[in-house]
């Protein structure tokens, strides 16, 4: 939760209500001046101030990717990092800023038609090749509407959950991401104790369906807390 990375006061000191009188905020918020927090930074979008922990690129901003902050660092500790500009080194498309993609380890400008072919190639290759450059198609969300005209059925390759049909989510499977069923009541789910811990899963599960949450199975008593079984349960 947010609490794990925020001190408890941060959430309580919100800016005053927006858009007019209490009880009737405007439906669209006009540009507001930045709120200053300790460190004097506007909107909290600074590289070295309260980095956002992540497990996959899709959790980050559009101009970010998810990775360990230090080269060869602990794979379990990942944060959102600024995307790489043109001619910078990369290992996958998501590392490159929008309008660029990763080719031969360098961020290069993409013309959309060419990029579509590149992405499909990467997806195909990713099933059988060295996975040091996998998840290469991981995302630039602006592309998905061009790439997927129909919602993916179960087993279809996807970039994000909105590429999948209703009742499915986009989850990692081997070195690709495919549409898998959202979990139903009673099904085993994955509860991530650490942000970033599911970045290493090669068979990622979907989240629990609407009205369900992933909790420890009440009758599942085991010595080790960490190995307890979690299932999707009604709120």
């Amino acid at each position: 939760t947010l609490n794990s990375v925020l001190n408890s006061n941060a959430i309580k000191n919100l800016p005053p209500p927006l858009g007019g009188a209490a009880g009737h905020p405007g439906s669209a918020v006009s540009a507001a001046p930045g709120i200053l927090y300790p460190g004097g930074n506007k909107y909290q979008t600074i590289d070295n101030y309260q980095p956002y922990p992540c497990a996959e690129d899709e959790e980050c901003g559009t101009d970010e990717y998810c990775a360990s902050p230090t080269r060869g660092g602990d794979a379990g500790v990942q944060i959102c990092l600024a995307c790489r500009k043109r001619r910078k080194r990369c290992m996958r498309h998501a590392m490159c800023c929008p309008g660029n993609y990763c080719k031969n380890g360098i961020c290069v400008s993409s013309d959309q038609n060419h990029f579509r072919g590149e992405i499909e190639e990467t997806i195909t290759e990713s099933f059988g090749n060295d996975h040091s450059t996998l998840d290469g198609y991981s995302r630039r969300t602006t592309l998905s509407s061009k790439m997927y005209h129909t919602k993916g059925q179960e087993g279809s390759v996807c970039l994000r959950s909105s590429d999948c049909a209703s009742g499915l989510c986009c989850a990692r499977h081997f070195w690709s991401k495919i549409c898998k069923p959202v979990l139903k009541e009673g099904q085993v789910c994955t509860k991530h104790r650490r942000k970033g811990s599911h970045g290493l899963e090669i068979f990622q599960r979907c989240y629990c369906g609407e009205g369900l949450s992933c909790r420890i199975q009440k009758d599942h008593h085991q010595a080790s807390n960490s190995s307890r079984l979690h299932t999707c349960q009604r709120h």
Epitope: A28, Y37, E59, G61
Partner: nanobody, 129 residues
């Protein structure tokens, strides 16, 4: 025209539960964070809970952690908040809000109301002791 419409508010006894819904129309919101804020009489609006565009990330205010659960259904352009073990201090008007996926995200992005572009009209929740 973009609209967020809340429903599910009402009056309940302390310890009871309610489920709020927020339906968005006018554009797809799968690339937006959806959140709930609340405002009690005479108080400032405060952050309650948010769910990110990636579905897997939820954030809660300390005061509701473990009691409220936020979720969303992108296919229906709807966000939900299940509220259990309600307390009199949860009494407020609850607003649904949507914030676009930013270029850079930070831990405070989700709780900062100025990041939210779209707001609903609110739904009243009253918890009596």
């Amino acid at each position: 025209e973009v609209q967020l419409v809340e429903s599910g508010g009402g009056s309940v006894q302390a310890g009871g539960s309610l489920r709020l819904s927020c339906t968005a129309s006018g554009r797809p919101f799968d690339n937006y964070a959806m959140a709930w804020f609340r405002q009690a009489p005479g108080k400032e609006r405060e952050f309650v809970a948010a769910i990110s565009w990636s579905l897997s990330r939820t954030h809660y205010a300390d005061s509701v952690e473990g009691r409220f659960t936020i979720s969303r259904d992108n296919a229906k352009n709807t966000a939900f908040m299940q509220m259990i073990s309600l307390k009199p201090e949860d009494t407020a008007v609850y607003y649904c809000a949507a914030a676009p996926r930013p270029k850079r995200v930070s831990v405070r992005y989700f709780s900062t109301s100025s990041n939210y572009d779209y707001w609903g009209q609110g739904t009243q929740v009253t918890v009596s002791s």
